[in-house]
Amino acid sequence: LPAQVAFTPYAPEPGSTCRLREYYDQTAQMCCSKCSPGQHAKVFCTKTSDTVCDSCEDSTYTQLWNWVPECLSCGSRCSSDQVETQACTREQNRICTCRPGWYCALSKQEGCRLCAPLRKCRPGFGVARPGTETSDVVCKPCAPGTFSNTTSSTDICRPHQICNVVAIPGNASMDAVCTSTSPTRSMAPGAVHLPQPVSTRSQHTQPTPEPSTAPSTSFLLPMGPSPPAEGSTGD
């Protein structure tokens, strides 16, 4: 004969555990039903009655099958430097991630606790390592033969154009200006493995940035002044 299907609540066999989506109630000493995601236990089970579940209230949630007396509160609304990538529902918490141009300086279990603006490399510097969701940009000086004329969190140093006749030689922050009609971007011959950067360490100090182009992160993070080479990269 097939074994009888026990309906909750029921007393488990000695040494056995309750089934999936059930829990053992110590007070009733019975296997009782869990509440589904989006619900919580309004009334706990007894020896004769099963768990009574109720829906989570607004701004609260439960993500798992549970027997909690109250639903969890959703996290606070996303800040201005964040975007809501998952809304608060009865079954899931709100998730905030950093908006484009920002990275997560302090993460939490899901989403981000503190966003910081991606560093912008000033002219004469390029992006050695790009920023990611959880890491800042790393800037380094442009090597001879390359330049960056932008203040940017994405631009690398690019090769100077090769001129038939040079009107103005290029430097770390400016492309070469040609007088001929057909400049080319192809590299000059030679086997230079690594051009030497033009700057020295003392030139790394970033001038006080305009807030619109390169906001400082020093008020957000435990670090000193903000030279362009700063940044740790990683996920």
Epitope: C121, R129, P130, A143, P195, P197, R201, A229
Partner: antibody
Amino acid sequence: EVQLVQSGAEVKKPGATVKISCKVSGYSITDYLLHWVQQAPGKGLEWMGWIDPEEGKTKYGQKFQSRVTITADTSTDTAYMELSSLRSEDTAVYYCAANSATGTMDAWGQGTLVTVSS
Amino acid sequence: DIVMTQSPATLSVSPGERATLSCKASQNVGSNVDWYQQKPGQSPRVLIYKASIRYTGIPARFSGSGSGTEFTLTISILQSEDFAVYFCMQSKSYPITFGQGTKLEIK
């Protein structure tokens, strides 16, 4: 011209620690990120991590994170990679590579062969 | 982790001919792909960075193209010194990952 010169070959026993150096000459180490890359015999390249010598900040690949430490001494323009709890599968050539503002690993050391054998 | 898949594993081409090497990323990596050449017993050296920019001193016969998930390294007229292993590498997200390599051999 900037050059990266690494320390010589090493033979280690399982469980030991190896520390390889990478001397940057021709220019300041602070103008580059220094990466370390592993190449096992007959295999491809595997990124281990990097250091920004100017900041002392590091980033490690998850595979190596628990066993690798990358440091840099700006006074001697030298970067170091220390790999602990060595096992036979760590037998490989280890390269340091410099990363400038072009965003690429544009200069490499000659490589250091580490042999792990009991 | 982003997986970089190179094809073919081995490519046999005659000197003077054109070689086309492929690299596919498992996720969108934008233009954050570099190409490296490695000869036996030597260190890798960069040929192309940011998918299409030829590195200083690299001959014009080397060119790179592609963005997103599909990238190509083309060597227009193969020279004897071009026979080597070629690796692509993505630096869009961590960990930085390399392709398994394409061995370019003389036909």
